[in-house]
């Protein structure tokens, strides 16, 4: 289901992307789904839709709800919802579980923590990094772009660290702080060449046209904590996001796993109301990290439906 | 077959920056890995840093950290070398390589295709 | 930064000669390492691969052997094209490193 989860603190700025992408020419309109009443374009409005983003310049408490995101195209229109949660501020220093982004892992070798959200907002140097509330000082802290990374990495650097930065519109400034995890590993670990799980090579996959199909691209990269590993799909060589088809997407950011000690990742291509011409393309599930990239090519046939006639 | 065409020598003043590029033909960029290695006049290779275009980043080795710049235009097909705070000691061939097919892998890191190298030279 | 050494810096030999030349890496590096040859005024060619794998089109004469920390370039009959020098190179880690380099001299 194309749902997503977003959240966020009062009077702070919130941006909610469409989970349902396409290209830039088509037209996203946006509702609130309690009411279907639509939500406005015009940036007066402290709550406005621009384009796939869905803005909350501040953000209330009342503003939680389920929001629909209707992507319109000459030749069809895709649903998507964003069920966003708006939180009040903390009078404490603790941040809630439901408040935090993804637990990112570092080693000695690899210590970027990225800022959560980041992209989606209109923000200029500097980010603004605090661990368990404290600002952070000292040269061992460098924040680069929109990471922040620590040098010579120890165990009591684990917690969880904040990032703040300011969002401009139009002129006006609003804050915005994302939250995430930091976890250090041990660098006991190894890695292989890519290994893929899933798909076979030159797998053909039975889909049904009309329905909706899942490809899965797995892969294991070695033991512990990878420098660089990423499962991607590309469409007949060109990625995802290039190739144009707002039917067929990549789901955002990729699951991590760890299978037998190994350190995995997945990524799911989803294709919305499988067409003839999907049968045509080559679909190309890629791992990669430091030593290389192994390529396994899907295919997709046409499953017949079970004539239930006698 | 990847091929690598690198831009032409350079004569550079102390203190100044140098950029060299290396165009590649054959087979899909974004995919690649472009290494840039070193060969200063008598001595070994030594391993400046590297990008992988699909991933968007570089890494650099320590030594260079800082001074080297490593980027990569898939619209060209060109990745790009750029060293600042040139001194004599970085008077050295530059070449840029990238990785091999076999079967059905692309080894990243074991350079199998190499660029003819750019001379630049670091004179007062 | 994992240091790769080699061993002999340079050697002298003759045609029809076996050679060794011996590649060690500071920490483990599993199978992650390749073996290049240079000739003056050329870029390196890639001989070896993963520590043993022969690359396609390379002469049946070169081989190379050795996992862990410990890493072996053979050539079993010298020939007068292969007189150059000889670099092993892991992968293993970023930074890449580059052993020092094997110069092979005719006798």
């Known amino acids: 289901k194309f749902s997503k989860q977003s959240w966020g603190l009062e009077n702070e700025a919130l941006i909610v992307r469409c989970p349902r992408q396409g290209k830039p020419s088509y037209t996203v309109d946006w509702y609130y789904s309690q009411t279907n009443k639509s939500i406005p374009t015009q940036e007066r409005n402290r709550v406005f839709a621009s384009g796939q983003l869905l803005k909350f310049l501040p953000a209330a408490v009342a503003d939680s709800g389920i929001y629909t995101c209707i992507v319109r195209s000459p030749t069809f229109n895709r649903t998507g919802y964003a069920n966003v949660t708006i939180y009040k501020k903390q009078s404490d220093c603790n941040v809630p579980d439901y408040l935090m982004y993804s637990t990112v892992s570092g080693s000695e070798k690899n210590s970027k923590i990225y800022c959560p959200t980041i992209d989606l907002y209109n923000w200029t140097a500097p980010l603004e990094w605090f661990k368990n509330c404290q600002a952070l000082q000292g040269s061992r802290y460098r924040a680069h772009k929109s990471f922040l990374v620590i040098d010579n990495v120890m165990t009591e650097d684990a917690g969880d660290y904040t990032c703040k930065f300011i969002h401009n519109e139009n002129g006006a400034n609003y804050s915005v702080t994302a939250t995430r995890s930091f976890t250090v590993k041990d660098e006991q670990g190894f890695s292989l060449f890519p290994v893929i799980g899933a798909p076979a090579q030159n797998e053909i996959k039975e889909v049904e046209i009309g329905k909706n199909a899942n490809l899965t691209c797995s892969a294991c990269f070695g033991k512990g904590t990878q420098f660089l590993a990423a499962v991607l799909w590309q469409l007949n060589g060109t990625k995802i996001t290039d190739f144009g088809e707002p039917r067929i997407q990549q789901e955002e950011g990729q699951n991590q796993s760890f299978s037998n000690g190994l350190a995995c990742l997945d990524m799911v291509l989803r294709i919305a109301d499988v067409k003839e011409e999907d049968l045509l393309l080559q679909y190309d599930c890629l791992a990669l990290n430091l030593h290389g990239l192994r390529r396994h090519t899907v295919r997709l046939s046409r499953k017949n439906p079970i004539d239930h006639h006698s | 077959e990847v091929q690598l065409l690198e831009s032409g020598a350079e004569v550079k003043k102390p203190g100044s920056s140098v950029k060299v590029s290396c165009k590649a033909s054959g087979g899909t960029f974004s995919s690649y890995a472009i290494s840039w290695v070193r060969q200063a006049p008598g001595q070994g290779l030594e391993w400046m840093g590297g990008?992988?275009?699909?991933?968007?980043?570089?890494n650099y080795a320590q030594k260079f950290q800082g001074r080297v710049t490593i980027t990569a235009d898939e619209s060209t097909s060109t990745a790009y070398m750029e060293l600042s705070s040139l001194r004599s000691e970085d008077t050295a061939v530059y070449y840029c390589?990238?990785?091999?097919?076999?079967?059905?892998?692309?080894?990243?890191?074991?350079?199998?295709?190499w660029g003819k190298g750019t001379t630049v030279t670091v004179s007062s | 930064d994992i240091q790769m050494t080699q061993s002999p810096s340079s050697l002298s030999a003759s045609v029809g000669d076996r050679v060794t030349i011996t590649c060690r890496a500071s920490q483990s590096i599993s199978s992650w390492l390749a073996w290049y040859q240079q000739k003056p005024g050329k870029a390196p060619k890639l001989l070896i691969y993963d520590a043993s794998n022969l690359k396609t089109g390379v002469p049946s004469r070169f081989s190379g052997s050795g996992s862990g920390t410990d890493f072996t370039l053979t050539i079993s009959s010298l020939q007068p094209e292969d007189f150059a020098t000889y670099y092993c190179q892991q992968t293993y880690a970023i930074p890449l490193t580059f052993g020092g380099g094997t110069k092979v001299e005719i006798k």
């Open positions: 990008i992988i275009p699909i991933f968007g980043t570089a």
């Open positions: 390589a990238s990785g091999f097919y076999s079967n059905d892998l692309y080894y990243y890191y074991y350079m199998d295709v």
